[in-house]
């Protein structure tokens, strides 16, 4: 569900939303750390209705959700939750 990508691309997100999306409607979360052409951290959410949205990393709900996912990943090893793709 939660993925971290290190890319050499510029910023992917033109607009960010802080609107709450319950986890039941989320298919995948992609985290793009700042650097490599983009000065900010970006979070991209793929929803179960096939739409995609960029989420404000400061939104409280996404911070809470990522914490839950991190806890879940640490208790359900060996299934990886963080995937690092180095170009």
């Amino acid at each position: 569900v939660l993925e971290v990508y290190y890319t050499s691309l510029r910023c992917r997100c033109v607009q960010e939303s802080s609107v709450f999306i319950p986890r039941r409607f989320i298919d995948r979360i992609q985290i793009l750390p700042r650097g490599n052409g983009c000065p900010r951290k970006e979070i991209i959410v793929w929803k179960k209705n096939k739409s995609i949205v960029c989420v404000d990393p400061q939104a409280e709900w996404i911070q809470r959700m990522m914490e839950v996912l991190r806890k879940r990943s640490s208790s359900t090893l060996p299934v990886p939750v963080f995937k690092r793709k180095i170009p």
Partner: antibody, heavy 123, light 106 residues
């Protein structure tokens, strides 16, 4: 007091269409996602559709995807379910339910439900 | 899709009894389970969400526990008004209801 009142049910032939409505009151309708859940006679509950508070996102299970469309009119405090290509197995009581609070971050499920409207698909 | 296996499907008990209903998820749903009560001809009523959080106004004789895939709903001392059908609902990944448990008077 939260109130949800469904209407629009009735008898329809297989392949036909029907539009259900749900009138909401007693809460800020535009701040909540809304759902439809159905119950076939003598059977259990089955989720049918959910729409986000602003109406921009809709979600469906595979068995109704492409046939049913959920929509809302926040100015009228109303929720709708357009049902096309109806089948005998769509026969059920259809409930409208209040879902998660769109402006929050608590992942809570459907809390208030209407009394339901009966849809019968038969020739 | 996540399946929710609820058991038993029916249960006979007496006023004052302690009653337990279980729901097993086909995969990890964390604590995202809710429990509903439904009486004949009526709409379902939410009793518990997030495994163990009681809705306002719901009596403390109702409780829930579990995490991951195995969940339990308990009525500590049955009251006459508790005879109804109970459903679990997972809301971790879309929505799936359990098949229901009809609680009848012995």
């Amino acid at each position: 007091e939260v109130q949800l009142v469904e209407s629009g049910g009735g008898l329809v032939q297989p392949g036909g269409s029907l539009r259900l409505s749900c009138a909401a009151s007693g809460f800020t309708f535009s701040s909540y996602a809304m759902s439809w859940v159905r119950q076939a006679p003598g059977k259990g509950l089955e989720w049918v559709a959910t729409i986000s508070d602003g109406g921009s996102d809709a979600y469906y299970p595979d068995n109704v995807k492409g046939r049913f469309t959920i929509s809302r009119d926040n100015a009228k405090n109303s929720l709708y379910l357009q049902m096309n290509s109806l089948r005998a197995e769509d026969t059920a009581v259809y409930y409208c339910a209040r879902d998660y609070y769109g402006s929050g971050y608590e992942d809570s499920p459907m809390d208030y439900w209407g009394q339901g409207t009966l849809v019968t698909v038969s020739s | 899709d996540i399946q929710m296996t609820q058991s038993p499907s029916s249960l006979s008990a007496s006023v004052g009894d302690r009653v337990t209903i279980t729901c097993k998820a086909s995969q990890d749903i964390n604590k995202y389970i809710a429990w509903y009560q439904q009486k004949p001809g009526k709409a379902p009523k939410l009793l518990i969400h997030y495994t163990s959080t009681l809705q306002p106004g719901v009596p403390s004789r109702f409780s829930g526990s579990g995490s991951g895939t195995d969940f339990t709903f308990t009525i500590s001392s049955l009251q006459p008004e508790d005879f109804a059908t109970y459903y679990c609902l997972q809301y971790d990944n879309l929505y799936t209801f359990g098949g229901g448990t009809k609680l009848e008077i012995k």
